[in-house]
């Protein structure tokens, strides 16, 4: 969490941002909040990006003002106009690209004063893994698949019964480049699986960590998966 304050002269206002990550090809949110103002027409929101000459986005007098927007963001940005009045200056970024990563500044002017805060935005690809029993294999085998990751992640297997065991010798992981030549499909196979155990396939890069669990008993198979973005800190 980054909290920024305005500088001397007129009054300053508090602006708060949260570091976040964007999934390539999907829409992302750059979070920013500020001390609200009672009049929408008095609020100016400007988003800047380090290394970019023009503005990322500008909202003033109750509407978008995009005449000075940098071309790399053209048609891809929006604020939540109905939430500006309550102090939400968050930016929606459409079709996130790898090059959108970097340092952004949320700059706010209201009738009370001005303030700004920086935000680190990471970009990559991350997806939920799915773990299944591989019935094609000759022995009891689990297959963990996740369709889109970037940068290349690490894959680690763990089990509830054999806690602390190293499964690297009995697993095999491959990365297959997807058609857009950036993201990759992750496939990991775990051999010599025992019944009545819960196995976890953990996929992690510097942006996200995802886990796919599978509980294998004689009578049933239960699956669960979750994904967590790393390093989301507020400013």
């Amino acid at each position: 969490l980054i909290i920024g304050f305005g500088i001397s002269g007129r009054h300053s206002i508090t602006v708060t941002t949260v570091a976040s990550a964007g999934n390539i090809g999907e829409d992302g949110i750059l979070s920013c909040t500020f001390e609200p103002d009672i009049k929408l027409s008095d609020i100016v929101i400007q988003w800047l990006k380090e290394g970019v000459l023009g503005l990322v986005h500008e909202f003033k007098e109750g509407k978008d003002e995009l005449s000075e927007q940098d071309e790399m963001f053209r048609g891809r940005t929006a604020v939540f106009a109905d939430q500006v009045i309550v102090g939400n200056a968050s930016l929606r970024l459409k079709n996130v690209q790898l090059t959108d990563a970097g340092t952004y500044k949320c700059y706010i002017i209201t009738s009370k004063g001005k303030g700004n805060a920086n935000l680190e935005y990471k970009t990559g690809a991350f997806s939920m893994p799915e773990v299944n029993v591989d019935y094609n294999a000759s022995s009891e085998t689990l297959r963990c698949e996740a369709p889109r990751w970037f940068p290349q992640p690490t894959v680690v297997w763990a089990s509830q019964v054999d806690q602390g065991a190293n499964f690297s010798e009995v697993s095999n992981t491959s990365f297959e480049l997807n058609s857009e030549n950036v993201t990759m499909k992750v496939v990991s196979v775990l051999y010599n699986v025992t019944i009545n155990n819960t196995y976890s396939c953990m996929i992690e890069n510097d942006i996200a960590k995802a886990t796919g669990d599978i509980k294998v008993t004689e009578s049933e198979i239960k699956r669960r998966s979750h994904l967590q973005l790393l390093n989301s800190k507020a400013s």
């Epitope: 500088i7 001397s8 002269g9 007129r10 400007q46 800047l48 380090e50 000459l53 023009g54 503005l55 500008e58 000075e68 340092t103 500044k105 700059y107 002017i109 001005k114």
Partner: antibody
Framework: QIQLVHSGPELKKPGETVKISCKAS????????MNWVKQAPGKGLKWMGW????????TYADDFKGRFAFSLETSASTAYLQINNLKNEDTATYFC??????????WGTGTTVTVSS | DVVMTQTPLSLPVSLGDQASISCRSS???????????LHWYLQKPGQSPKLLIY???NRFSGVPDRFSGSGSGTDFTLKIRRVEAEDLGVYFC?????????FGGGTKLEIK
């Protein structure tokens, strides 16, 4: 198109005063701090300080405290540098430069000031 | 004040060659926030300076990938992979970690 356009060259005598302008266009003037940089003939660059274009508060580097003054005409998106009691060593090209984050991403065209008796 | 020392003062190169400019600071440029605010500017003859590289290694918008920056702490390098005629001019390193912000003395890149 983002640009900073300076006033023309100045020829002054020692003891006189000069006021240089820097007009900004193509971006919201009060969002970015305006810096001033001195370049003496055949020499490197020296940061003089900056002015907060929102509040109008100037900050001067130690070597430029006293005879130097930064000011604004916000309605005209213009920053000014005034040098009082000119000395021969003030002969230089002066640049305004837009501060974005921690660097100068747009520089003015520069104004050459010559001080000679 | 932080003193920025550039070497060489003058760098004669042939077009198509690689050029390398060194910049050394009198104290570490690592800010308390973890960032290193070392930048490179190019001033072509008769023009104002232009930003090339910010924060050690980040190319500014529109700067060709022939230009790359590296280094840490007090030692930094700018490399130009294949020098073109439009690259000629004076290169300045600059720090904005410590106030006052300071510049190196410049390195003149010229044709051999």
């Amino acid at each position: 198109q983002i640009q900073l356009v300076h006033s023309g060259p100045e020829l002054k005598k020692p003891g006189e005063t000069v006021k240089i302008s820097c007009k900004a266009s193509g971006y919201p003037f009060t969002t970015y701090g305006m810096n001033w940089v001195k370049q003496a003939p055949g020499k490197g660059l020296k940061w003089m300080g900056w002015i907060d274009t929102y509040s109008g508060v100037p900050t001067y580097a130690d070597d430029f405290k006293g005879r130097f003054a930064f000011s604004l005409e916000t309605s005209a998106s213009t920053a000014y540098l005034q040098i009082n009691n000119l000395k021969n060593e003030d002969t230089a090209t002066y640049f305004c430069a837009r501060r974005s984050f921690w660097y100068f991403d747009v520089w003015g065209t520069g104004t050459t000031v010559t001080v000679s008796s | 004040d932080v003193v920025m020392t550039q070497t060489p003062l003058s760098l004669p190169v042939s077009l198509g060659d690689q050029a390398s400019i060194s910049c050394r600071s009198s104290q570490s440029l690592v800010h308390s926030n973890g960032n290193t605010y070392l930048h490179w500017y190019l001033q072509k003859p008769g023009q104002s300076p232009k930003l090339l590289i910010y924060k050690v290694s980040n190319r500014f918008s529109g700067v060709p990938d022939r230009f790359s920056g590296s280094g840490s702490g007090t030692d930094f390098t700018l490399k130009i992979r294949r020098v073109e005629a439009e690259d000629l001019g004076v290169y300045f390193c600059s720090q904005s970690t410590h106030v006052p912000w300071t510049f190196g003395g410049g390195t003149k890149l010229e044709i051999k």
